[in-house]
Structures are given as structure tokens and as C-alpha cells.
Amino acid sequence: APTSSSTKKTQLQLEHLLLDLQMILNGINNYKNPKLTRMLTFKFYMPKKATELKHLQCLEEELGPLEEVLNLAQSKNFHLRPRDLISNIRVIVLELKGSETTFMCEYADETATIVEFLNRWITFCQSIISTLT
């Protein structure tokens, strides 16, 4: 059974991930972002189901494309370079889902824009955090 300290650690990691995703979304939605139109043409894949930490595999598999989209944006929209930002997210995601279990992600048929994609994973983080508090 998870201890209170491990639950707290998970909660803090999820909050960190949530803040990173929200920061990316805010940077993209910045009214001064000249690349928004092109960024919205990138196709992102959504999980069929995302209710447990193991489902973060589906997020992890989209972080490569996410980095490429962020490379299009002006760096001043974000605090970190896309490579560093994605690297940080990868570390958090890996710690949350674990590296031992090889979970095969199932994707929904419909693709999403980067905005829809980020909102989906922000909602996921908020949902899991609420179950931990």
C-alpha cells in the first residue's frame, strides 16, 4: 500500500507536471505567438483511456512531437529551451509511471491539436491530484 510520504511525493510530481503543461499552454496561447496557426496543424494523439499513472505512457510517446512544436515558438514564450523543458517533463513522467512496467498505449481514433492535447493532460493531472488530496 502506498505510504503517506510516497503519496505526497506523487502529488508534488503531478503538481510540477501540471505547472509545466499549463506554462506550455499559456506560452502557446500567447497572443503574440506568430507560429500558432502552424502549431495547430500538428496532429497529436490522445489516449483512449487516461485514469491511472500508467496511462502517462501515452503522454510520454507524444513528448517528441511536443518538443518539435515548441521549437517553432519564440523562446521568450517559455522559461526554458524546448529541449530542457521536455527533458524535465520526461523525468517527471518516468518517475510517475515507472520504467519497469511496459504499458502499451491505446490511442483514440481522433487526433487533437496541441491545445486540446495539453488541456487533456492538464485535466488528467488535476483529476489524479484530487484523488490524492
Epitope: 502552424r38 496543424t41 505512457q57 510517446e61 517528441g64 512531437p65 518539435e68 490511442y107
Partner: antibody, heavy 123, light 107 residues
């Protein structure tokens, strides 16, 4: 169906520069990140770098930085790879290949390839 | 840089047999791995992407699996046209790197 057609074989002297072209047909080049990969005779595959033709941003492997320049001409849907200060170990088949984030997940990988261009560096 | 180690270097089998090719990554790369087939004088051809997904037009006898940083390409029953060199590639981070290849030859 997307096709990549590369320019013909080249023979160059050490120290010279070679420029290879890769023409995209069946779609616009701006839908793809154009990557270059090489293969020395009897050897494995080595990634050189890539360009985003939409904004000309490039990424190069450390081994090639300073010697390689990848460019693209969106008016002709053609990508180019220029390698300077050639040496004998640059003798290889050079391939262009594509990655895109606009279509299916499969096309995020090296799905389409050119036929290859043999570059021979010999004195 | 991420190093991909393929084994064996050469695999000698007969048509109808099962082939198992291995690719080990030097660090965690999630499912950012693909497999390519290359025949003499030809460009590589995508077989498997995202570690386990079959590329379009590729026969179902080809399959990919992953366990941690170990990846496997399996050909369930070899056909004469399957004898070629196979490469794995990681897309996790640049520089993208290939394994050194496994030559699948007729026994």
C-alpha cells in the same frame, strides 16, 4: 504517394565540397522535416541532420557540425545537403528521408526514403 | 549519445524458421524505436515504429516488442525475401542513432 528523387553519383577530390539534392513529389516539402542519413560501404547507417523547410531551422549531428549545411527550396520542393572539406572516409551513399507531424503516427518515423546518392572521395 | 547494440551480428536461418533479432539501448528511450529492413543496393524500409506498431504494407509475420531498454524484432516464419540486413533506430533524442545492424542470411 510521396516520392523522393535524389541527384546522381558524384566523384570528388579530398578537400572539395559536394552538394546533393532531394526532390519531393506527391506532396509539398513544407509538410516534412527533411533528414539526411549516410552509409559508408559495407557499414551501418549514420544520421547527419535535418531541416524544417517551413522556417529553415536545422539540427546537425555533432560529428558533422561545421562541415555540413542542409537547405531547402520550397519553390521547387527540393532539399539539399552540402558537405565540405571532404575526406576519403566521407565516401558513402547519402540518403534523404522524411518525418512529418501532420499525418499519421507512422509518418513521424523515417517512412519515405530517396534512392540514395553515392559520393566517392578519391585523389 | 544513445548507443543501440544489435545482436547477433549475423543470423543464419532457413526459410520457415522463426527469427529473433535484438536491439539494446544504452539508456531509457521509452517506445521511441523503429526497425528497418535493407536489401543490397536499396534504401532502408520502415517495418516497425513506436517499438511495436507494424508499418503499412508490412506482412503480419513481422512484429516488435519491448522490455525496458531491450527491443526485439521477430519474424514468425521466414520467407525467402526476408533475408536482408535489419537496423534499429532511436528517435528519443538527437542525434538519432542506429544500431550496427543484423545480417539475416540463408543457412
Amino acid at each position: 504517394q510521396v516520392q523522393l528523387v535524389q541527384s546522381g553519383a558524384e566523384v570528388k577530390k579530398p578537400g572539395a565540397t559536394v552538394k546533393i539534392s532531394c526532390k519531393v513529389s506527391g506532396d509539398t516539402i513544407t509538410a516534412y522535416y527533411m533528414h539526411w542519413v549516410r552509409q559508408a560501404p559495407g557499414q551501418g547507417l549514420e544520421w547527419i541532420g535535418r531541416i524544417d523547410p517551413e522556417d529553415d531551422s536545422t539540427k546537425y549531428a555533432e560529428n558533422f557540425k561545421g562541415r555540413v549545411t542542409i537547405t531547402a527550396d520550397t519553390s521547387t520542393d527540393t532539399a539539399y545537403m552540402e558537405l565540405s572539406s571532404l575526406r576519403s572516409e566521407d565516401t558513402a551513399v547519402y540518403y534523404c528521408t522524411t518525418v512529418t507531424f501532420y499525418y499519421t503516427r507512422e509518418l513521424r518515423w523515417f517512412a519515405y526514403w530517396g534512392q540514395g546518392t553515392l559520393v566517392t572521395v578519391s585523389s | 549519445d544513445i548507443v543501440l547494440t544489435q545482436s547477433p551480428a549475423t543470423l543464419s536461418l532457413s526459410p520457415g524458421e522463426r527469427a529473433t533479432l535484438s536491439c539494446q539501448a544504452s539508456q531509457y528511450i521509452s517506445n521511441y524505436l523503429s526497425w528497418y529492413q535493407q536489401k543490397p543496393g536499396q534504401a532502408p524500409r520502415l517495418l516497425i515504429y513506436s517499438a511495436t506498431s507494424l508499418a503499412s504494407g508490412i506482412p503480419a509475420r513481422f512484429s516488435g516488442s519491448r522490455s525496458g531498454t531491450d527491443f526485439t524484432l521477430t519474424i514468425s516464419s521466414l520467407e525467402p525475401e526476408d533475408f536482408a540486413v535489419y537496423y534499429c533506430l532511436q528517435h528519443y533524442s538527437t542525434p538519432y542513432t542506429f544500431g550496427q545492424g543484423t545480417k539475416l542470411e540463408i543457412k
